[in-house]
């Protein structure tokens, strides 16, 4: 944020007799006074361009990686497992989000110059990506739990059910992201670059807290608990039964979940601290405000980085993904068929045998 000088003729004239004693930093200040808080954000000019470079790299990696993942899954029609369908949706979510990164990058440098429509759409895609991501991972954990702990294929056999679950996830993600679509807009302030943020009039702070606590609970904490429960029991079953093959088959899924947590947990913890501070549970100070703002910026980069990491996990840990990719390359004559591994099967990351479906 650039330096600005708000020197006024007198404070009585500046406030026009308004009682602003209850206004708190940025979240409650009306748009025309957004730049008036005396706790100034620290200018981090260097970080601005570092962030743009990160965004550009993530954009390219995500575009390439997720496109390949979708291609491989769509090609392997025959042995496609339930988990593959979830991973296909996961790749789609990441791909859609990646498409918005150039806009976010530009806004880091010039402020929000794209107007309210793009502010709503791009913010919506970002939120939907996050929520659909964790909900899909929760569904994968339930699927693995049912397949390994209860040795059931009820979900795997009913393809329409899986499609319904995926559609429901997208619907629920849209619902959780709805506040962003309704309330985000371009906010113009004197001497400060325009910003894309929630504006709900005089009750902005209260609404923002409610609209942050609800999605954080249902969109992050609940799926997280589901995942911990399912994988806890799945791991216990695998260790007790000494199922080496299935244990290996879980590596990709565990890696996907672990990376998701490493990328999104820090951001959500900082967001929680920010929420506690804004709701006066912990005292707000200028120092804390600045530290939290910087932490939000840093941890948000981690979250954004997540959209390009899943394809890398599949490439380095998922044997079947590599095989599937090689198969596509061989079909199109880009590599010789002799270089294909002997056990190269069409499935992307899974095969079904007996009553369980193993994912690798």
């Amino acid at each position: 944020m650039e330096d600005f000088n708000m020197e006024s003729d007198s404070f009585e004239d500046f406030w026009k007799g308004e009682d602003l004693s209850n206004y708190s930093y940025s979240s409650t200040l009306p748009p025309f006074l957004l730049d008036a808080a005396p706790c100034e954000p620290e200018s981090l000019e260097i970080n601005k361009y570092f962030v743009v470079i990160i965004y550009a790299l993530v954009f390219l990696l995500s575009l390439l990686g997720n496109s390949l993942v979708m291609l491989v899954i769509l090609y392997s029609r025959v042995g496609r497992s339930v988990t593959d369908v979830y991973l296909l949706n996961l790749a789609l979510a990441d791909l859609l989000f990646a498409l918005t990164l150039p806009i976010w990058a530009a806004s880091k440098v010039n402020g929000w110059i794209f107007g309210t429509f793009l502010c709503k759409v791009v913010s919506l895609l970002k939120e939907v990506n996050f929520y659909s991501g964790i909900l899909l991972l929760a569904c994968i954990s339930v699927d693995r739990y049912l397949a390994i702990v209860h040795a059931t294929r009820t979900l795997t056999q009913k393809r329409y059910l899986v499609k319904f679950i995926c559609l429901s996830i997208w619907g629920l993600s849209l619902l959780l992201a709805l506040p962003v679509l309704l309330f985000r807009r371009t906010v113009y302030s004197s001497n400060v670059s325009p910003a894309c943020y929630e504006d709900m009039g005089n009750n902005t702070a209260n609404w923002r807290m409610l609209l942050r606590i609800l999605p954080q609970s249902f969109g992050f904490i609940v799926p997280l608990l589901i995942m911990l429960f399912c994988y806890g029991f799945t791991l216990r079953t695998l260790f007790k039964a000494h199922m080496g093959q299935k244990h290996r088959a879980m590596r990709v899924i565990f890696a996907v979940v672990l990376i998701f947590l490493l990328c999104w947990l820090p951001y959500n913890l900082v967001l929680l601290a920010d929420t506690l501070m804004r709701t006066q549970v912990i005292q707000e100070t200028c120092e804390r405000r600045n530290h939290i703002d910087r932490a939000l910026d840093a941890t948000e980069i981690l979250g954004i980085l997540h959209s390009c990491l899943n394809p890398l996990i599949y490439a380095f840990i998922g044997q079947k993904f590599r095989h599937g990719l090689l198969k596509i390359l061989a079909i199109h004559g880009l590599i010789s068929k002799d270089s294909l591994p002997k056990d190269s099967r069409p499935s992307f990351v899974g095969s079904s045998s007996g009553h369980t479906s193993t994912t690798l």
């Epitope: 000088n5 808080a37 005396p38 706790c39 100034e40 200018s43 707000e284 200028c286 120092e287």
Partner: nanobody, 125 residues
Framework: KVQLVESGGGLVQAGGSLRLSCAAS????????MAWFRQAQGKEREFVAA????????KYSDSVQGRFTISRDNAKNTVYLHMNSLKPEDTAVYYC??????????????????WGQGTQVTVSS
């Protein structure tokens, strides 16, 4: 927590100038909104001027606007009050105050957590 020590007060002729300094000890001075208040004998403590954390925004009371200038040097942990064209009615004890929140401009003494001992400024006619 921050400790504040004012200096630079004294006796000055009407129309003269003075520069008050407020040295802060303690951490994170650059995160405090700083202000000057004054209290004349038998009167309430009144707001004089305030400055934002990085010094790019300032606020003044009507009575000192155009004559007084508040500034800060975060590297030296010091805030200054440059007083020009002094009048007899500027005679008071001048206090330095610090607000760790900075959520909004505060023009009453209740908005500031930390205070100095004060420095006497006397303007003779």
């Amino acid at each position: 927590k921050v400790q504040l020590v004012e200096s630079g007060g004294g006796l000055v002729q009407a129309g003269g100038s003075l520069r008050l300094s407020c040295a802060a000890s303690g951490r994170a001075f650059n995160y405090y909104v700083m202000a000057w208040f004054r209290q004349a004998q038998g009167k309430e403590r009144e707001f004089v001027a305030a400055i934002s954390t990085r010094g790019s925004m300032t606020k003044y009371s009507d009575s000192v606007q155009g004559r007084f200038t508040i500034s800060r040097d975060n590297a030296k942990n010091t805030v200054y009050l440059h007083m020009n064209s002094l009048k007899p009615e500027d005679t008071a004890v001048y206090y330095c105050a610090a607000d760790p929140r900075g959520s909004s401009w505060s023009f009453s003494s209740g908005g500031y957590d930390y205070w100095g001992q004060g420095t006497q400024v006397t303007v003779s006619s």
